[in-house]
């Protein structure tokens, strides 16, 4: 149950996550299972442990084996096992089955191919994408963040797709490749101009000075899985990250929900320790997809706290 298979190619970077989860405050120790020898944490080593991650920079065939990770909470130790296999690079173009990640399906409406395991790495765009060893070229192919989008998907687009990227560790670069199969299926989905469910247009939200406040931007974009749909907050027409107020943050990641079959996203804006000047700002909930952009504006007003003192 708490064992995970991981694989990579020699001379490429491989990063493995401990199959046991924990909290950021828990310490994680890694060991070679056969020898019970501790894996060092110093980054000068080719193989080293970094919290929940075990890093092979780069990997060698001799690194293959079972690794033990122990997640230590103050009162309980959780043990996991990573079964790592490092393969020699193939001289021909074929990617063997044992190097393939899970197959993904797409359709005319949804043709996202995510690059497997990329979230474990420190990489920068753009990704390089290959199909059957050929670099993908043409306007139909768009490398967007950690996935590939194929416009007007056809059955001929089925095949094995390889993403290639560079992992950077303390100024040193390491190549990583990952391959998965893509199949094409018919899907009865559709996409609409975004509909913002919350907040209402020109809504006034009451907040208490000195307290925390949350604003949720929620919008639906159609039926079935959507791509290139997003919700976000702006302050006085500026992105939250550019506004430069650390008390005001967007919740990392967007929650995707399907209500009545509709694909919806929401983004929470968290305001810590509300201040008077926050009442002067204009808060815009933006929802956008391929059809366009919709904006709802919210303003804050002071709510007088009820005096609970006796």
């Amino acid at each position: 149950k708490f064992s995970k298979q991981s694989w990579g190619l020699e001379n490429e970077a491989l990063i493995v996550r401990c199959p046991r989860q924990g909290k950021p405050s828990y310490t994680v120790d890694w060991y070679y299972s056969q020898t019970n020898k501790s894996i060092p944490t110093q980054e000068r080593n080719r193989v080293f442990a970094s919290g929940q991650l075990l890093k092979f920079l780069p990997a060698a065939v001799a690194d293959s084996g079972i690794y033990t990770c122990i997640v230590r909470s103050p009162t309980f130790n959780r043990t996991g096992y990573a079964n790592v296999t490092i393969y020699k690079k193939q001289s021909d173009c074929n990617v063997p089955d044992y190097l393939m990640y899970s197959t993904v399906s797409g359709s005319e409406k949804n043709s996202k191919i995510y690059c497997p395991t990329i979230d474990l790495y420190n990489w920068t765009a753009p990704l390089e994408w290959f199909k059957n060893c050929q670099a993908l070229q043409g306007s139909r192919y768009r490398a967007h963040k950690s996935f590939l989008v194929i416009d007007n998907v056809m059955t001929e687009d089925a095949g094995d797709y390889t993403c290639k990227f560079i992992h950077n560790e303390n100024g040193a670069n390491y190549s990583v490749t990952a391959t998965r199969s893509f199949t094409v299926k018919d899907e009865q989905g559709f996409s609409l101009f975004p509909v913002i469910g919350a907040p209402a247009q020109n809504e006034i939200k009451e907040v208490e000075i000195g307290k925390n406040a949350n604003l949720t931007c929620s919008a639906c974009f159609g039926k079935g899985t959507q791509f290139l749909a997003a919700v976000l907050w702006q302050l006085n027409g500026t992105k939250i990250t550019d506004f430069g107020e650390p008390r005001i943050q967007q919740e990392e990641g967007q929650n995707q929900s399907f209500s009545n079959g509709l694909a919806c996203l929401d983004m929470v804006l968290r305001i810590a320790d509300v201040k008077e000047e926050d009442l002067l700002l204009q808060y815009d909930c933006l929802a956008l997809n391929l059809h366009g952009l919709r904006r709802h504006t919210v303003r804050l007003s002071r709510k007088n706290p009820i005096d609970h003192h006796s």
Epitope: Q21, G22, S25, P74, T75, F76
Partner: antibody
Framework: QVTLKESGPTLVKPTQTLTLTCTFS??????????VGWIRQPPGKALEWLAH???????QYNPALKSRLTITKDTSKNQVVLTMTNMDPVDTATYYC????????????WGQGTTVTVSS | DIVLTQSPASLAVSPGQRATITCRAS??????????MQWYQQKPGQPPKLLIY???NVESGVPARFSGSGSGTDFTLTINPVEANDIANYFC?????????FGQGTKLEIK
């Protein structure tokens, strides 16, 4: 927001088994780092930790009561159940369930509690 | 078990004054450089409410009048200034070792 509510019998007879249910909302017990614990408080006395259960089904019990306690979770129902066998009048107390959250392990949200009297 | 001893058992403080409650652990509650000690407030007929976690962090929504300090085995909860609605029992609690244990409580009264 996180809420928890305890339910179960208010009166049990000595030697019987007590079953308490904690129904919660605002978090999922399948999310890494989450836990739910049980604490009791006899009338006018201090709090006593009984047990807790973690997201990955790790269970921890108070050693003094371990032989009498069983804690389980139903992630789909957002419920945690505590059973306590061989009840005795000294087990009369208010029983609380609480959420364990944060970067570190501590009870940050508590239910209102349910009072259990053990008497024949 | 880690035994937590609170003192005093009760104290009476005038509004506007400082209240100090101490909690001594029978062994260190340190874990990776962090003190796993919490403070709770409990008013009659209510569940405990978290005030301070990991020795000195004030829980969100708790007034800044409440503060915590200490490390290793000795910890302090300070309320400054005390207000009338601070009348309650205050408990310390450690989560360093199982069983998690609580102090016996300190009853705060207003003069």
């Amino acid at each position: 927001q996180v809420t928890l509510k305890e339910s179960g019998p208010t009166l049990v007879k000595p030697t019987q088994t007590l079953t308490l249910t904690c129904t919660f909302s605002g978090f999922s017990l399948s999310t890494s780092g989450m836990g739910v614990g049980w604490i009791r408080q006899p009338p006018g006395k201090a709090l006593e930790w009984l047990a807790h259960i973690w997201w990955d089904d790790v269970k921890q019990y108070n050693p003094a009561l371990k032989s009498r306690l069983t804690i389980t979770k139903d992630t789909s129902k957002n419920q945690v159940v505590l059973t306590m066998t061989n009840m005795d009048p000294v087990d009369t107390a208010t029983y609380y369930c609480a959420h364990i959250g944060g970067d570190y392990d501590y009870f940050d949200f508590w239910g209102q509690g349910t009072t259990v009297t053990v008497s024949s | 078990d880690i035994v937590l001893t609170q003192s005093p058992a009760s104290l009476a403080v005038s509004p506007g004054q400082r209240a100090t409650i101490t909690c001594r652990a029978s062994e260190s509650v340190e874990y990776s450089g962090t003190s796993l000690m919490q403070w709770y407030q409990q008013k009659p007929g209510q569940p405990p409410k978290l005030l301070i976690y990991v020795a000195s962090n004030v829980e969100s929504g708790v007034p800044a009048r409440f503060s915590g300090s200490g490390s290793g085995t000795d910890f302090t909860l300070t309320i400054n200034p005390v207000e009338a609605n601070d009348i309650a029992n205050y408990f310390c609690q450690q989560s360093r070792k199982v069983p998690w244990t609580f102090g016996q409580g300190t009853k705060l009264e207003i003069k």
